[in-house]
Interface confidence: low
């Protein structure tokens, strides 16, 4: 009775169970009653990352420097190349097919989380008592100056974009 299902790492062809090619190798010819499955290693800059019956290996991903990409991990016959972005840029997707410049936080917003190669800058509004007067990918919201600790008084109130302005206390003569 010909098999209808095969064991793990096998495939059914012509009513026969043949061995799959191991990762890093491609199928050249199916097994027969008398011969084993014939597999060949993937060429340079090619890979296959699973047990397979593929007749062609996949090309390694190209980390295109024109799109701000560079190689994070070189591919092998069993793994694809992993791309990342040049410093100051981050990937636009998990696959990292292209990069964009890190976002800056506008005045009134501070950096909550600095960008990485795979995630953008996370900004947060400066809460009451804090300000940011610059557009920056690194600066957090700064606390308003404490006039009291300098024995001064608030002359001009602070905003989310400006620090308070301190001035001398009016002393009764």
């Amino acid at each position: 009775e010909p098999p209808t299902a095969c064991r793990e790492k096998q495939y059914l062809i012509n009513s026969q169970c043949c061995s799959l090619c191991q990762p890093g190798q491609k199928l050249v010819s199916d097994c027969t009653e008398f011969t084993e499955t014939e597999c060949l290693p993937c060429g340079e800059s090619e890979f296959l990352d699973t047990w397979n019956r593929e007749t062609h290996c996949h090309q390694h991903k190209y980390c295109d420097p024109n799109l701000g990409l560079r190689v994070q991990q070189k591919g092998t016959s069993e793994t694809d190349t992993i791309c990342t972005c040049e410093e100051g840029w981050h990937c636009t997707s998990e696959a990292c097919e292209s990069c964009v410049l890190h976002r800056s936080c506008s005045p009134g917003f501070g950096v909550k989380q600095i960008a990485t190669g795979v995630s953008d800058t996370i900004c947060e509004p400066c809460p009451v008592g804090f300000f940011s007067n610059v557009s920056s990918a690194f600066e957090k919201c700064h606390p308003w100056t404490s006039c009291e600790t300098k024995d001064l008084v608030v002359q001009q109130a602070g905003t989310n974009k400006t620090d308070v302005v301190c001035g001398p206390q009016d002393r009764l003569r």
Partner: antibody, heavy 119, light 110 residues
Framework: QEQLKESGGGLVTPGTALTLTCTAS????????MNWVRQAPGKGLEYIGV??????IYYANWATGRFTISKASSTTVDLKTTRLTTEDTATYFC??????????????WGPGTLVTVSS | DVVMTQTPPSVSEPVGGTVTIKCQAS??????LAWYQQTPGQPPKLLGY???NLASGVSSRFSGSGYGTEFTLTISDLECADAATYYC????????????FGGGTEVVVK
């Protein structure tokens, strides 16, 4: 002082091919992406294409096959046009990108060269 | 190529006023967006890039914001020197790389 200057413009007849040259002074452009942009009289800006620092060239869809960008030296970039029509009458600008990669940030511009296509 | 829709085509505001210009991209362009100012007879001048980064030497009265498909340029405390045409330039760098300008906004300062 870093400057870009376009040359090669002028009055040409329809069907003519033309080569415009962008020359940098004060620095070389080998580590920057160089872009070409045009502007018809009284109209908006139109992006043509870019050559990156590593020599890869990208064209706007409408410009593919109509223009050829090449880097002639570390200080010059050329824009070759094929079979000009009256619709190609425009001021042609070259502009340097902020990095060597493709970018929308074009920080240094030439004054432009006017190409007039007329019979 | 990505299509950039810029609004309004023209705007008139008094000195000291505020102008807001919007650019909408036909697809997600992340923060690949720059803003330019152009006065007659002059080449464009870069105001900001990467959506919210101000170019060197540009007044902090100009500010850019947005991400993905919606972007804004705000000019506050308008001065006579701000009278110009403003353009956005959006870039898509996926499988079809390309930059596209918006149609422009003429700013008249009264």
């Amino acid at each position: 002082q870093e400057q870009l200057k376009e040359s090669g413009g002028g009055l040409v007849t329809p069907g003519t091919a033309l080569t415009l040259t962008c020359t940098a002074s004060g620095s070389d452009i080998s580590s920057y992406a160089m872009n070409w942009v045009r502007q018809a009289p009284g109209k908006g800006l139109e992006y043509i294409g870019v050559i990156t620092s590593s020599g890869t060239i990208y064209y706007a869809n409408w410009a593919t096959g109509r223009f050829t960008i090449s880097k002639a030296s570390s200080t010059t970039v050329d824009l070759k046009t094929t079979r000009l029509t009256t619709e190609d009458t425009a001021t042609y600008f070259c502009a340097r990108g902020i990095t060597g990669a493709v970018t929308t940030g074009l920080s240094l511009w030439g004054p432009g060269t006017l190409v007039t296509v007329s019979s | 190529d990505v299509v950039m829709t810029q609004t309004p085509p023209s705007v008139s505001e008094p000195v000291g006023g505020t102008v807001t210009i919007k650019c909408q991209a036909s697809q997600n362009i992340y923060n690949n967006l720059a803003w330019y100012q152009q006065t007659p007879g002059q080449p464009p001048k870069l105001l900001g890039y990467a959506a919210s980064n101000l170019a060197s030497g540009v007044s902090s009265r100009f500010s850019g914001s947005g991400y993905g498909t919606e972007f804004t340029l705000t000019i506050s405390d308008l001065e006579c020197a701000d009278a110009a045409t403003y353009y956005c330039l959006g870039g898509y760098y996926g499988n079809n790389v390309g930059n596209t300008f918006g149609g422009g906004t003429e700013v008249v300062v009264k």
